[in-house]
């Protein structure tokens, strides 16, 4: 049995920050779990981790240099990413693992969210508003 994950297809970080909500078909209350956010189609970069344990405070960390925070809901984890750069525009996938109580559960691969970062260029390039709605 796999947990299903829902994400917005696209989010825009106009101020170099974005809230990405991962909604699960599973209630995380009183569970030990590891929710993570991954960058790239191959999910090669683990952006942020939210570790929850019913007996401890929520742990949020990034081992890849992202400025992130996390908030827990009953059936969701929201990742708050700050100080994003234009070159971090990519597709981001939510992942969830439930370690306790048994059985171990993880998720079906989600559709992913494209985070489009506008502003804070690492090197200057001309800005263009993009196509308007047809």
């Amino acid at each position: 049995n796999k947990i299903l994950v829902k994400q917005s297809p696209m989010l825009v970080a106009y101020d170099n920050a974005v809230n990405l909500s991962c909604k699960y078909s599973y209630n995380l209350f009183s569970r030990e779990f590891r929710a993570s956010l991954h960058k790239g189609l191959d999910s090669a970069v683990e952006v942020c981790v939210v570790y929850g344990n019913y007996s401890q405070q929520l742990q949020v960390y990034s081992k890849t240099g992202f400025n992130c925070d996390g908030k827990l809901g009953n059936e969701s984890v929201t990742f708050y990413l700050q100080n994003l750069y234009v070159n971090q525009t990519d597709i981001y996938f939510c992942k969830i693992e439930v370690m306790y109580p048994p059985p171990y559960l993880d998720n079906e691969k989600s559709n992913g969210t494209i985070i489009h970062v506008k502003g804070k260029h690492l090197c200057p390039s001309p800005l263009f508003p993009g196509p308007s709605k047809p």
Partner: antibody
Framework: EVQLEESGGGLVQPGGSLRLSCAAS????????MSWFRQAPGKGLEWVSV???????NHADSVKGRFTTSKHNSKNTVYLQMNSLRSEDTAVYYC???????????????????WGQGTTVTVSS | EIVLTQSPATLSLSPGERATLSCRAS??????LAWYQQKPGQAPRLLIY???NRATGIPARFSGSGSGTDFTLTISSLEPEDFAIYYC?????????FGQGTKVEIK
């Protein structure tokens, strides 16, 4: 006028390399999402790669490790470097722009709204 | 990877007739489906996006409907320039995938 023009296709032996170019006019590739697609003779369309506005790239599993996508913002051009070519890579290659629309709360790309005319790549000995 | 199945493979109709093309997804793509027209030797052209919205400059005789897994492209009255191959494409998840196409030919 908004348009894309591919070049660089040709006949190459298996194991060989080619670099395709996609020159944009009427808009800037630096702030758009650009994809490469291909269409084998008599077949449907297959996504090959995407390069996002900030330069991050993703490739289809079928070309991963062999093809590399890049762009030159000042030349307003996107490239597809194809190495270790195989006979199954024979196709017409198109570049296309992802049309993007909406506001902060409802922002998405809606489809490929600008396409180039395509360039033919034939891999044969 | 989401598989899109189009039917019929070929549709033989006369100018002025109504064309109904179907696209079925292997799993729900919500309304994130586009339709393209392709003529021989030409690039695809975006007709419909998000299942039912006409792209810029597309005539009103083209309309799209559906959500979830079943979608329809309707051409209300075929014009001579409408005879072509039509592809559906999903953007619900990556990679974006296309159907195998429906050829609309002159009867």
């Amino acid at each position: 006028e908004v348009q894309l023009e591919e070049s660089g296709g040709g006949l190459v032996q298996p194991g060989g390399s080619l670099r395709l170019s996609c020159a944009a006019s009427g808009f800037t590739v630096s702030s758009n999402f650009m994809s490469w697609f291909r269409q084998a003779p008599g077949k449907g369309l297959e996504w090959v790669s995407v390069i996002y506005s900030g330069g991050s790239i993703n490739h289809a599993d079928s070309v991963k490790g062999r093809f590399t996508t890049s762009k030159h913002n000042s030349k307003n051009t996107v490239y597809l470097q194809m190495n270790s070519l195989r006979s199954e890579d024979t196709a017409v290659y198109y570049c296309a722009r992802h049309g993007i629309t909406g506001t902060t709360g409802d922002y998405h790309y809606y489809g490929m709204d600008v396409w180039g005319q395509g360039t033919t790549v034939t891999v044969s000995s | 990877e989401i598989v899109l199945t189009q039917s019929p493979a070929t549709l033989s109709l006369s100018p002025g007739e109504r064309a109904t093309l179907s696209c079925r997804a292997s799993q729900s793509v919500s309304s994130y489906l586009a339709w393209y027209q392709q003529k021989p030797g030409q690039a695809p052209r975006l007709l419909i996006y998000d299942a039912s919205n006409r792209a810029t400059g597309i005539p009103a005789r083209f309309s799209g409907s559906g959500s979830g897994t079943d979608f329809t492209l309707t051409i209300s009255s075929l014009e001579p320039e409408d005879f072509a191959i039509y592809y559906c494409q999903q953007r619900s998840n990556w990679p974006p995938t296309f159907g195998q196409g429906t050829k609309v030919e002159i009867k």
